[in-house]
């Protein structure tokens, strides 16, 4: 039950990073135009990824996109790699995630195989809010730059009479959206990978199964022998015969070498 | 069609309050804000402020102590009130719409005149 | 506050001929957002209200003859008519429409020779 726990709600906090990996993405504010200790402008200026826009006081709001590939800084170049790599890996992760959840039956799939695909679509959502906080951090750490070389450049005089304002620009919403969606991606993944581990059985070279027989006697089946225990490539235990002998389906533990009654 | 009325008393006594009021008709104060303008006689025009369509309010600086634009949506009207007022306050007053493009003023009232006199 | 200087105070103009009035600011009305300038021209005709000419420092409001041009960028502007008329008599203003408080020039008084 914990193990179908940990999973699902790995599965929704990944869902939920991912979707705001994509929400950030696609945002325009990730660098807004810096109103402090600045002169009041009747124009808002704000960028993201994609494209810049102006925001008048009218409410009049025009956007143009950065038609240009070759033109483009390759730090922002960069962080849509990181951002598109970080949706794509989550988007895959998603899917077979999907198909792993325990509390879903697909055909006659095995828990070991649950298991791996758990585990990969765990590492995949860890990869996945890394590249989203990397790709956050990094244009964060280039507005911070240029914050700092605009402050140094703001008032440049122009023979002393007339003076030009250079915009700076700050941190936008979309960077606080990537931080926290990254972050709850990688939170995802960790949790399905903890499932994972919940999920697969424990592999050894001796694996026995414990049953009552009818008398005071107690009988041991040592694994290794496949045609006598059901054991061997097998991971899953199977029932013999009826006789008081139990899976670990029924008794939720895993049989290993010290499993002896 | 887009129309901007100006109303209030023609003459105020110093030190007392200017109240006046724009009744629009022809567009929505949701959507569109209104800037307000005085012109002293045979002098060039003054800025006093404006109300965009979200509330916010922008003054002139030298102005700012006195004056306060406000918006009355059920009555489709924008008012002005200046306080204070002194000899120097005298001009024709008006209020024009701010175009949705370009921060420009693209629909004017007639204008009001308004004398400060004891 | 953005100091809007005009010239000249008076321009006498011919009929059919061309007029040209200037404006400087005293700060960029440039926006590097979108490339902009927040510049705004205003006729005032006699006994009249302003009336809105142009915006962005170059586009003519709609309904304004294309004998009204506007140019220029960051400080220095320029609003060109280019065969006057006589009912385009009348004072001429610049406005920066960019920082608060907006501030208008001092005006161009436009008359037939």
């Known amino acids: 039950m914990a193990v179908t726990a940990c999973q699902g709600l790995g599965f929704v906090v990944s869902l939920i990073g991912i979707a705001g990996i994509i929400a950030a993405t696609c945002m325009d504010q990730w660098s807004t135009q810096d109103l402090y200790n600045n002169p009041v402008t009747a124009v808002f200026n704000y960028q993201g990824l994609w494209r810049s826009c102006v925001r008048e006081s009218s409410g009049f709001t025009e956007c143009r996109g950065y038609f240009t590939l070759l033109g483009l800084p390759a730090m922002l170049q960069a962080v849509r790699a990181l951002m598109i790599v970080g949706i794509v890996l989550g988007a895959i992760g998603l899917l077979v995630s999907i198909f792993a959840l325990k509390c879903i039956r697909i055909g006659s799939m095995e828990d070991s195989a649950k298991a791996n695909m758990t585990l990969t679509s765990g590492i995949m959502f860890i990869v996945s809010g890394l590249c989203a906080i990397a790709g956050v951090s990094v244009f964060a750490n280039m507005l911070v730059t240029n914050f700092w070389m605009s402050t140094a450049n703001m008032y440049t005089g122009m023979g002393g009479m007339v003076q030009t304002v250079q915009t700076r620009y700050t941190f936008g919403a979309a960077l606080f959206v990537g931080w926290v969606a990254g972050g709850l991606t990688l939170i995802g993944g960790v949790m399905m990978c903890i499932a994972c581990r919940g999920l697969a059985p424990e592999e050894t070279n001796y694996k026995a199964v414990s049953y009552h027989a009818s008398g005071h006697s107690v009988a041991y089946k040592p694994g290794g022998f496949k045609a006598s225990t059901g054991f061997g490539s097998n991971t899953k235990n199977k029932k013999i015969y009826d006789g008081g002998a139990r899976t670990e389906d029924e008794v939720q533990s895993y049989p290993s070498k010290h499993d002896y009654v | 069609q887009v129309q901007l009325q100006e109303s209030g008393p023609g003459l105020v006594k110093p030190s007392e309050t200017l109240s006046l009021t724009c009744t629009v008709s022809g567009f929505s104060l949701t959507t569109y804000g209104v800037h307000w303008i005085r012109q002293p006689p045979g002098k060039g025009l003054e800025w006093i402020g404006v109300i965009w369509a979200g509330g916010s309010t922008n003054y002139n600086s030298a102005l700012m102590s006195r004056v306060t634009i406000s918006v009355d949506t059920s009555k489709n009207q924008f008012s002005l009130k200046l306080s204070s007022v002194t000899a120097a306050d005298t001009a024709v007053y008006y209020c024009?719409?701010?175009?949705?493009?370009?921060?420009?003023?693209?629909?004017w009232g007639q204008g009001t005149m308004v004398t400060v006199s004891s | 506050d953005i100091v809007m200087t005009q010239s000249p105070l008076s321009l006498p103009v011919t009929p059919g001929e061309p007029a040209s009035i200037s404006c400087k600011s005293s700060?960029?009305?440039?926006?590097?957002?979108?490339?902009?300038?927040?510049l705004t021209w205003y006729l005032q005709k006699p006994g009249q209200s302003p009336q809105l000419l142009i915006y962005?420092?170059?586009t003519g409001e709609s309904g304004v003859p294309d004998r009204f041009s506007g140019s220029g960028s960051g400080t220095d502007f320029t609003l060109k008519i280019s065969r006057v008329e006589a009912e385009d008599v009348g004072v001429y203003y610049c406005?920066?429409?960019?920082?608060?408080?907006?501030?208008f020039g001092g005006g161009t008084k436009v008359e037939i020779k």
């Open positions: 406005q920066n429409a960019y920082f608060y408080p907006f501030t």
């Open positions: 700060q960029t009305l440039l926006n590097s957002g979108n490339q902009k300038n927040y």
């Open positions: 962005w420092a170059s």
């Open positions: 024009a719409r701010a175009a949705y493009y370009g921060n420009g003023l693209d629909y």
